[in-house]
């Protein structure tokens, strides 16, 4: 029987700068029941606080709700593991909520083949930003990326859409069924997961010629 091994805080993420969650890996098992506690303080303060919510984020997590989340302060946090034989401490992690945002995927992905009479046909892709993100405040700039591929192809074709919420793609293989997905990221932060795939059948008469 041993004291617990050193834990490690390995990830913190926020969906929208209003709340965030951190997760840790437990250290090696000392062969005894182990209690974990996350304590934190804000930079410039000495007062230590304990994690407000160990439940919402699942096992080995700490969730900071709206009342505990401040965009303009760095959080310094540490996890303590304790069993009957002793304690171990993680390294401290410095967390700035601005830099840990990982939005939900974009919503309402719509894909349509457009065949104007006077111009080349194209694939028109449209989506909405995730609901948790409030773009009106100006706190956020969301960037988007689209990927698509024929159903049986191995390689994805990736297009960067910038801040647009719609995009046109001209070069497609006629008669193929395509999968289309979109994802987003804030200017500082992490890419969201890809949205669920939308399928679109490209007509056989879809022409790529001028």
């Amino acid at each position: 029987q041993l004291p617990p091994g050193k834990p490690e805080i390995f990830k913190c993420r926020s969906p929208n700068k209003e709340t965030f969650t951190c997760w840790w890996r437990p250290g090696t098992d000392g062969g005894l029941p182990t209690n974990y506690s996350l304590t934190y303080h804000r930079e410039g303060e000495t007062l230590m606080h304990e994690c407000p919510d160990y439940i919402t984020g699942g096992p080995n997590s700490c969730h900071f709700g709206k009342q505990y989340t401040s965009m303009w302060r760095t959080y310094i946090m540490m996890v303590n593991a304790t069993n009957q034989m002793g304690s171990s401490f993680s390294d401290e992690l410095y967390v700035d909520v601005t830099y840990i945002v990982q939005p939900d995927p974009p919503l309402e992905l719509a894909v349509e083949v457009k065949q104007p009479e006077d111009r080349k046909p194209y694939l028109w892709i449209k989506w909405s930003p995730p609901t948790l993100i409030d773009l009106k405040t100006g706190w956020f700039t969301l960037l988007y990326e689209i990927r698509l591929k024929p159903e049986k192809a191995a390689e994805w074709e990736i297009h960067f859409a910038g801040q647009q919420t719609e995009f046109k793609i001209l070069s497609l293989h006629p008669g193929q069924k395509y999968l289309v997905q979109v994802r987003c990221k804030p200017d500082h932060g992490y890419w969201s997961a890809w949205s669920p795939a939308t399928f679109i059948q490209i007509p056989s008469d879809f022409t790529m010629n001028d």
């Epitope: 041993l2 490690e8 171990s88």
Partner: antibody
Framework: EVQLVESGGGLVQPGRSLRLSCAAS????????MHWVRQAPGKGLEWVSG????????GYGDSVKGRFTISRDNAKKSLYLQMNSLRAEDTALYYC?????????????WGQGTLVTVSS | DIQMTQSPSTLSASVGDRVTITCRAS??????LAWYQQKPGKAPKVLIF???SLESGVPSRFSGSGSGTEFTLTISSLQPDDFATYYC?????????FGQGTKVEIK
Amino acid sequence: EVQLVESGGGLVQPGRSLRLSCAASGFTFDDYAMHWVRQAPGKGLEWVSGIIWNSGHIGYGDSVKGRFTISRDNAKKSLYLQMNSLRAEDTALYYCARDSGRYQSYFDYWGQGTLVTVSS
Amino acid sequence: DIQMTQSPSTLSASVGDRVTITCRASHIISSWLAWYQQKPGKAPKVLIFKASSLESGVPSRFSGSGSGTEFTLTISSLQPDDFATYYCQQYNTYSRTFGQGTKVEIK
């Protein structure tokens, strides 16, 4: 420049006490855990004791538990080791070492050591 | 406590040799391992932390690898300044423990 300077070593009889000090400079002392490590003549390194930044957790090696007490004074940028009931096997060079973090990490700076000799 | 066992205890090598020192932990310690170099009459100096991260200012000929219970320190091309004693240390538990040391001497 980070500096750790140990003092308080000397010749002491078995069963007596000694207090070692470590004066720190060149860094924010209360941002780091601190430790005592010893080395008997011609032998390897042995961790003696450690204390986290705010004195909220203290640990001791098995061979000194119940006899040695570690403490720190952040205002004075000083680390201490109170050694009671000294034995011949406590004879060693005692190093003060800085932890690289506030809690539990590797030792990134060491002092030059102070020699403790326990002999009658 | 976690025991750390180093091998070999002594290693004779020449300048330019590739040198490997092994450290084995009695229990899994993840990657929480540091390597130190000590020269006679001097304090130890950290070379590697978290099993494979090179401490700032340490020459790149030093490298560390391993995780769990088996770790190695490698000096890719031994230099005259590298003849010293090397120690591994675990910091997986608050009670730190060192290996018994490996003395690298001139062949």
